[in-house]
Amino acid sequence: VGGYICEENSVPYQVSLNSGYHFCGGSLISEQWVVSAGHCYKSRIQVRLGEHNIEVLEGNEQFINAAKIIRHPKYNSRTLDNDILLIKLSSPAVINSRVSAISLPTAPPAAGTESLISGWGNTLSSGADYPDELQCLDAPVLSQAECEASYPGKITNNMFCVGFLEGGKDSCQGDAGGPVVSNGELQGIVSWGYGCAQKNRPGVYTKVYNYVDWIKDTIAANSHHHHHH
């Protein structure tokens, strides 16, 4: 909501999760792994990489089925705490200028830092208009105090807020699982909010920094290493 059409393939780590329709976003973090939101779990997912217009085959797409879908073991569907999911692709993505991985964070998100949020979610705060072309939004990371004041009792240490307290610009339904990137690092995953783009109701995002070890451990445990003796 309140964003702009991204330059084509300018967000090369952005993926679309498809189950006959686009239902969530995600981020490519290595040639065979995608991170998304825990609440985007489905038993069958096709991962679509290199997308810009999700309704048109433009020639840069890679459609790869999910081989493994691993939700965080402490995901809570009621509070959306630990709202993170890993998807192992059935075959590695071909990395090129339009499809490439985003780095995991080396430090937690800092208030005031500019970030890029992207997705194919609803662009209306009231009503429905799901775009075909990838939308981008530049938004600042808010302080934890502002975040907690916006959602008293709802914000855990695994969440942070990004956006504008005055409303008008925000992620929305259909953007879940997608990236929040600051300084070339994946800081957030689109998670939840009360409505979209409402005053004093900024978007709430999964704090990826808290899951770097879980991500690395899960990837290691689900990768086949051939040991030669």
């Epitope: 239902f23 969530c24 569907s77 429905a128 259909g174 939840w192």
Partner: antibody, heavy 125, light 107 residues
């Protein structure tokens, strides 16, 4: 295979209550929601309400608000729909149907892909 | 509430005919529309979801199109088992609403 099996037909008197069950199998119950839809004789489909199997959040049709309660029992993968203060115009076939969850900022898509066989409820004095 | 208006309410057709049913939403619902087939005494069966995606196991003679407010279900070559009532449903927001139905009858 994925299926929803509903309880048997009921005959009730006006003013009474009815509770219809819907047992799910073949999938993870808490990954989906359940909608309830009814169809009066010779009429079209009328949505009654929706319940999240994972959070128990509900959304009811306004005309039934106060008379209907939807619940789930995750231990038995069963959804229930109770309708109180029955009237003759509640005579219908009642269906449960599987739908997607409405969680966070996931795309809201409220279609129903698997339906129960239907439960006939007759309200007559 | 979003009103769904289906037309025609009934259509008489022969085996092999192309049949088109339309559904109009009172406000924009993007692609969030489903089509169901119902035979007498049976539960509805999902045919098309998200306006144009064919449900697994449904014959390819069924297709859906549209976005926003205007949607179409097409049966490219009517088969004997297709004589039934068809309903559209907006899947965009609560309260969920259905069209009034279109009965496809044998001519």
């Amino acid at each position: 295979q994925v299926q929803l099996v509903q309880s048997g037909a009921e005959v009730k008197k006006p003013g009474a209550s009815v509770k219809v069950s819907c047992k799910a199998s073949g999938y993870t119950f808490t990954d989906y929601a359940i909608s309830w839809v009814r169809q009066a004789p010779g009429q079209g489909l009328e949505w009654m309400g929706w319940i999240s199997a994972s959070t128990a959040d509900t959304n009811y049709a306004q005309k039934l608000q106060g008379r209907v309660t939807m619940t789930t029992d995750t231990s038995t993968s069963t959804a229930y729909m109770e309708l109180r203060s029955l009237r003759s115009d509640d005579t219908a076939v009642y269906y449960c149907a599987r739908g997607t969850e409405v969680v966070g900022k996931m795309t809201v898509y409220l279609g129903m892909d698997v339906w129960g066989q239907g439960t006939t409820v007759t309200v007559s004095s | 509430d979003i009103q769904m208006t289906q037309s025609p309410s009934s259509v008489s057709a022969s085996v092999g005919d192309r049949v088109t049913i339309t559904c109009r939403a009172s406000q924009g619902i993007s692609r969030w529309l489903a089509w169901y087939q119902q035979k007498p005494g049976k539960a509805p069966k999902l045919l098309i979801y998200a306006a144009s995606s064919l449900q697994s196991g449904v014959p390819s003679r069924f297709s859906g199109s549209g976005s926003g407010t205007d949607f179409t279900l097409t049966i490219s070559s009517l088969q004997p088992e297709d004589f039934a009532t068809y309903y559209c449903q907006q899947a965009n927001s609560f309260p969920i609403t259905f069209g009034g139905g279109t009965k496809v009858e044998i001519k």
